[in-house]
Amino acid sequence: GWVWNQFFVPEEMNTTSHHVGRLRSDLDNGNNSFQYKLLGAGAGSTFIIDERTGDIYAIEKLDREERSLYILRAQVIDITTGRAVEPESEFVIKVSDINDNEPKFLDEPYEAIVPEMSPEGTLVIQVTASDADDPSSGNNARLLYSLLQGQPYFSVEPTTGVIRISSKMDRELQDEYWVIIQAKDMIGQPGALSGTTSVLIKLSDVNDNKPIFKESLYRLTVSESAPTGTSIGTIMAYDNDIGENAEMDYSIEEDDSQTFDIITNHETQEGIVILKKKVNFEHQNHYGIRAKVKNHHVDEQLMKYHTEASTTFIKIQVEDVDEPPLFLLPYYIFEIFEETPQGSFVGVVSATDPDNRKSPIRYSITRSKVFNIDDNGTITTTNSLDREISAWYNLSITATEKYNIEQISSIPVYVQVLNINDHAPEFSQYYESYVCENAGSGQVIQTISAVDRDESIEEHHFYFNLSVEDTNSSSFTIIDNQDNTAVILTNRTGFNLQEEPIFYISILIADNGIPSLTSTNTLTIHVCDCDDSGSTQTCQYQELMLSMGFKTE
């Protein structure tokens, strides 16, 4: 049978030939010609055999971490007969481990984030090294972890590689730490190999700082001409925290005048001082307000860091602006009777310089030929006014500072021209009437109405009469309807076209004004040749024809 012991080859042997062991048949007694053969993966390349003796040699450096065992086959033949002396047999050559691999951190790079101010013992991260050596071969792959850099803030558990906090850290002093961990095999004994890794530990922010004004006093200015909503300046507090923990809100703590407001620009974390009400240099030329700032988000457990909000004082100086003249009223309404003579007094406007220097004021009227204004603001007429032409005048009065002609203000002035009874009533239209030759007495010839260009104080009332001449010898009479109309009636029977073809009647119309005005209005009445039915249509038609130069049958 075969005689051999278990075969071992230490890995990483530098010799070109390392004696592994010996294959032997117990029939090999020295008196026979035996030849030993080696077969299988690695035979002839990694392992050779002295076929005379059965001695096996490793002729290559072996790496257990690449291959830990070789399965080979052994043969022995008698070279004199060529026959196998023993059945072919399989055997194993094991590559024995040496500590030739250092621990390696395969999951590099390591990075961890831990909140600042975390208490001692807080777990940060676990680092794990791998050792390619045989874990069952002594302590070649038994690791111990230690901290090379990172004291006194961190510690590492020797057997697990768990990194913990050993001292509180303030992100505002240092926001990241490089920790170097060493892993040693052979549980740290002499001859151990080591590997290191770096761990970047970043401190995440907690809101342990309140915002603080760096300036205890801000000086701002605002022009008195600034409209409400104007940003007049910014104030800024600083918060050593970052991100959401540095977001802040500004507010006004004191402002008796309630003239200002503060809004927060959440992008820049600045406080913007806003004008809430317009200011007037002449009324108050400086203000003092107090602003405060606090964080937008504060966790309940961190309230101890935010007990008293930081404040600052803001002095606001109002800048004087040369303001335009200011009229006493936003507009003026004056009244003047029509027909008053040129140079008549209309009214007085008044504007003053609101500034301290009190510049004298010059007045002017924009585009008016009817009115004039002097340096005292007195408006007079340049012409007699006729209400019936214009009852109202819309003037634009301009006030200009004498010392700065660019400072101008304008206001509307409305002048109402008051009525006087300067117009008599008159026919509301032109009247041309017709009467048939065969007309009877009392026949209505025409209804007339009147108009008066004057303004009625209460309500116009007109009085209609025939002139004295027409009253005495008239063929017609008038009846006043008492409603500002009157009717003309025939005062006889029968008219003769040939003898008197046309009548001109003078009608007096009086108004109820004081004094009353009367006008004389002529009514023309044509005598017509009417048909038997006495139709005025025919009469009117015939008259129409006549008036056009045609003769009718």
């Epitope: 010996r22 007694n29 020295g30 076929e51 005379r52």
Partner: antibody
Framework: QVQLQESGPGLVKPSQTLSLTCTVS??????????WSWIRQHPGKGLEWIGY???????FYNPSLRSRVTISVDTSKNQFSLKLSSVTAADTAVYYC????????????WGQGTLVTVSS | EIVLTQSPGTLSLSPGERATLSCRAS???????LAWYQQKPGQAPRLLIY???SRATGIPDRFSGSGSGTDFTLTISRLEPEDFAVYYC?????????FGQGTKLEIK
């Protein structure tokens, strides 16, 4: 009667390859049962076994020289050869070829030897 | 490898005397694979004994070998003038084949 005869240059330059041939007469290398060996003897020193070859071509070399030695066989010429590469002065020696009995593992026939000097 | 140590390094004897040469192995060697050689100046070595005790062809019977394990002996019972030479022991029980450093037998 088996006879062995070494032949080859007596002088080799350092770093070059030493080449020797052993011609066998009086018996066939191919007959089997024998291994054919090379041995050397440094001047005034003992013997050092270099390696062997079987007619089939299987070889085995002294581990101390393995990386530099090649032994080959030419059965048609009834010869076997030695090549030793990268020689230095330490390789200066008398080189013997010999027959190795497969049963006794003893070197029963030897050539007379040839001195090879390594020198530039 | 097995180291063979021969003693004495030089043995001075007169013809007719008995010579005893020793060969000690660094580890046990099968007696089947120990041989003795004789080398005269300018000549190749000649096989005397194989298998620790078997004489090679043509070797006179005054040469004999013995021993086992780690201690082996070559004995020349009565020295002849042609026996004065250098003697080497050799093992091939395990690889590589190794030789002793030699014992020089010289005429006294």
């Amino acid at each position: 009667q088996v006879q062995l005869q070494e032949s080859g240059p007596g002088l080799v330059k350092p770093s070059q390859t030493l080449s020797l041939t052993c011609t066998v007469s009086g018996g066939s290398i191919s007959s089997g049962g024998y291994y054919w060996s090379w041995i050397r003897q440094h001047p005034g020193k003992g013997l050092e076994w270099i390696g062997y070859i079987y007619y089939s071509g299987s070889t085995f070399y002294n581990p101390s020289l393995r990386s530099r030695v090649t032994i080959s066989v030419d059965t048609s010429k009834n010869q076997f050869s030695l090549k030793l590469s990268s020689v230095t002065a330490a390789d200066t020696a008398v080189y013997y070829c010999a027959r190795d009995s497969s049963s006794s593992r003893a070197l029963d026939y030897w050539g007379q030897g040839t001195l090879v000097t390594v020198s530039s | 490898e097995i180291v063979l140590t021969q003693s004495p390094g030089t043995l001075s004897l007169s013809p007719g005397e008995r010579a005893t040469l020793s060969c000690r192995a660094s580890q046990s060697v099968s007696s089947s694979y120990l041989a003795w050689y004789q080398q005269k100046p300018g000549q190749a070595p000649r096989l005397l004994i194989y298998g620790a005790s078997s004489r090679a062809t043509g070797i006179p019977d005054r040469f004999s070998g013995s021993g086992s394990g780690t201690d082996f002996t070559l004995t020349i019972s009565r020295l002849e003038p042609e026996d004065f030479a250098v003697y080497y022991c050799q093992q091939y029980d395990s690889s590589p084949r190794t030789f002793g450093q030699g014992t020089k037998l010289e005429i006294k």
